[in-house]
């Protein structure tokens, strides 16, 4: 129906993959629809097949190359198309010139490790995965811990205004168990957005040593 | 904000055509897809066709391909629709409307957040 919700929003990795989410409200869950990828200047297209996630929801994503290949650049728009199987048909039901640098999420950073650990304190690294060399160092990042007794969604978020793969968590409670994540975003892009959390890293901060105050 | 100002409706005799322009002002009218949409007497409004801000793509409802084409000039603010073969059941208050940002172009008005007054069109038999 004309009056209501259809939503197709595509992110770029940065390097060779466009993950794309296509939503339509009353649309047939078992409905076969693809997205089409056509570059404005590169010699090749893509396509990918849409799989349901949800009761009116659909992804896929778009593998353009090798996961660390530089398939586009700044200047390039790409025509990203949603077709839907209608009886013997294609019909394109969505439309968009899709500027990869403008919409932008990042894989989700990785290798998280402890790199020291003490009673009251805990050093922490990662890496970024598949990020483009464009961005230099022209990434931020947030971070936040899991205490014991709260949620995820309770833990302040610690910002990292600056391209720092590490950080040192302060005042911890000695002898306690932790969770970390964090996650990456470029400055670059008017709809660029947060990467995926990484997966969480568990540990242990030392316990207090004994007649001591530490 | 956008603000859209259709032009072009009119009386035609079937068969006819006409051009609507719709003129814009306010975000960057640049990187704005527009849409056109149509009501007739009694009925819903409907999708007819819609452009994206680079013009690489067009979108058209099934009921027009072929007669309407949708272009725009990007330096002058303002998006066309071309109508041939104009029909008795073309007759509506046509719209034109902004996708909204960050959105695709799409057939339904929920991706649209800045609409225009609308123009008559009205075609005789």
């Known amino acids: 129906a004309v009056n209501g919700t259809s939503q197709f929003t595509c992110f770029y990795n940065s390097r060779a993959n466009i993950s794309c989410v296509w939503s339509q409200d009353g649309a047939l869950q078992d409905t076969s629809c693809q997205v089409h990828a056509w570059p404005d200047r590169r010699r090749w297209n893509q396509t990918c097949e849409l799989l349901p996630v949800s009761q009116a929801s659909w992804a896929c994503n778009l593998i353009l190359g090798a996961p660390d290949s530089q398939k586009l650049t700044t200047v390039d728009i790409v025509t990203l198309r949603v077709l839907c199987r209608e009886g013997v048909r294609w019909r394109v039901m969505a439309i968009q010139d899709f500027k990869p640098f403008e919409n932008l999420r990042l894989m989700a950073p990785i290798s998280l490790q402890v790199v020291h650990v003490e009673t009251h304190r805990c050093n922490i690294s990662w890496e970024i995965s598949q990020a483009s060399h464009y961005f230099e160092r022209h990434l931020e990042f947030e971070a936040r811990t899991l205490s014991p007794g709260h949620t995820w969604e309770e833990a302040p978020l610690l910002t990292l205004k600056q391209k720092q793969e590490w950080i040192c968590l302060e005042t911890l409670t000695p002898d306690t168990q932790y969770e970390f994540q964090v996650r990456v975003k470029p400055l670059q892009g008017e709809f660029t957005t947060w990467s995926p959390w990484s997966q969480p890293l568990a540990f242990r901060t030392k316990p207090a040593a004994l007649g001591k105050d530490t | 904000q956008v603000q859209l100002v259709e032009s072009g409706g009119g009386l035609v005799q079937a068969g006819g055509s006409l051009r609507l322009s719709c003129a814009a002002s306010?975000?960057?009218?640049?990187?704005?897809?527009v849409g056109w949409f149509r009501q007739a007497p009694g009925k819903e409004r409907e999708f007819v066709a819609a452009?994206?801000?680079?013009?690489?793509?067009?979108l058209y409802a099934d009921s027009v391909e072929g007669r309407f084409t949708v272009t725009r000039e990007n330096a002058k603010n303002t998006v066309y629709l071309q109508m041939n073969s104009l029909k008795p059941e073309d007759t509506a208050v046509y719209y034109c409307a902004a996708v909204r940002r960050g959105w695709a172009v799409v057939r339904t008005e929920g991706a649209y957040d800045f609409w225009g007054q609308g123009t008559q069109v009205t075609v005789s038999a």
């Open positions: 452009i994206t801000w680079s013009s690489h793509s067009t």
């Open positions: 306010g975000r960057t009218f640049s990187t704005t897809d």
